[in-house]
């Protein structure tokens, strides 16, 4: 067995904000330290926490595709928010990818919602 | 003094499963995260999974995901490595490491798995 | 993830002679958390230095870390008989924790 220094991880990262936890648990926006005696802040713009927790390590903020804007920038306590670009949605049977929405409504069809973000045109038949 | 002492290992036929465990004295472990660390024969150190003080949050390389599990009995100071379709490239000595970020201040002397028909 | 990039590979000196080992990160990493390791033959590694520089309880003054962001390095003052041996770095900054492949320190 190696013997060490008994608590190396309670040395401070002095970048990072810190409080203890409640019940073991730490804030949206923070980690816990592997000593379970603080909780750090997560980094702004780079990761994040939504709910109280344990975690060792604050979740990774998503970036947003080519092809989708950012409609919302990562905080601390939120993810970013990706939109597809207009003219293009995801469907929710495939929501890895903004697939491009149709330009127009087949013969004998009239268009009855337009493309958005989360849906591509909507067309129904035309009444005779 | 602290101690890390690991158990389980042993020869596993490929698909086969292994708990490894690894029992330590001698600091609150229910407070500190603890990780499993790896080494392949003649290889260097590979990070294989990690768990939080209260066992709430586990973390695995993308290596391990899905067939190792990481957990932990509090109440027996004891560190557990279920290990499920093994394969020949999981030969190695697994060690038990106090834990994850900072650094790995203490060690077990690890224990030998081998992987192979 | 992070991939840290250590050399030389193998560095051959002799006792008495300064040693330094380079560890180079991918992407930045937080000094508190980059930790480098000692490893000899059929033995757990052992910490030398966590949080870039600060030496471990019971490491010598002879060892040394310093840098920041993508490169970090390990010096060794004087080479003892003892410290011939494969040293590696780990970062824990981002998720992955990942090592360093090591650095053998051999005898000339």
């Known amino acids: 067995i190696t013997r060490q220094s008994l608590d190396p991880q309670r040395r401070a990262a002095p970048q990072q904000k810190r409080s203890s936890p409640t019940e073991g648990l730490c804030p949206p926006g923070h980690h816990i330290s592997e000593d379970s005696r603080e909780c750090i802040s997560c980094k702004y713009g780079q990761d994040y926490s939504t709910h109280w927790n344990d975690f060792l390590f604050c979740l990774r903020c998503t970036k947003c595709d080519s092809g989708e804007v950012e409609v919302n920038s990562c905080t601390t306590t939120r993810n970013t928010v990706c939109q597809c670009e207009e003219g293009t949605f995801r469907e929710e049977d495939s929501p890895e990818i903004c697939r491009k929405c149709r330009t127009g409504c087949p013969r004998g069809m009239v268009k009855v919602k337009d493309c958005t973000p989360w849906s591509d045109i909507e067309c129904v038949h035309k009444e005779s | 003094e602290v101690q890390l002492l690991e158990s389980g290992g042993g020869l596993v036929q490929p698909g086969g499963s292994l708990r490894l465990s690894c029992a330590a004295s001698?600091?609150?472990?229910?407070?500190?995260?603890m990780s499993w660390v790896r080494q392949a024969p003649g290889k260097g150190l590979e990070w294989v999974s990690a768990i939080s003080g209260s066992g709430g949050s586990t973390y695995y390389a993308d290596s391990v995901k899905g067939r190792f599990t990481i957990s932990r009995d509090n109440s027996k100071n004891t560190l557990y490595l279920q290990m499920n379709s093994l394969r020949a490239e999981d030969t190695a000595v697994y060690y038990c490491a106090k834990g994850v970020r900072i650094s790995f201040d203490y060690w077990g002397q690890g224990t030998l798995v081998t992987v192979s028909s | 993830e992070i991939v840290l990039t250590q050399s030389p590979g193998t560095l051959s000196l002799s006792p008495g002679e300064r040693a330094t080992l380079s560890c180079r990160a991918s992407?930045?990493?937080?000094?508190?958390?980059l930790a480098w390791y000692q490893q000899k033959p059929g033995q757990a590694p052992r910490l030398l230095i966590y949080g870039a520089s600060s030496r471990a309880t019971g490491i010598p003054d002879r060892f040394s870390g310093s840098g920041s962001g993508t490169d970090f390095t390990l010096t060794i003052s004087r080479l003892e008989p003892e410290d011939f041996a494969v040293y590696y770095c780990?970062?824990?900054?981002?998720?992955?924790?990942?090592f360093g492949q090591g650095t053998k320190v051999e005898i000339k």
């Open positions: 992407q930045s990493v937080s000094s508190s958390y």
């Open positions: 780990q970062q824990g900054s981002n998720q992955p924790v990942t």
């Open positions: 001698g600091f609150t472990f229910s407070s500190y995260a």
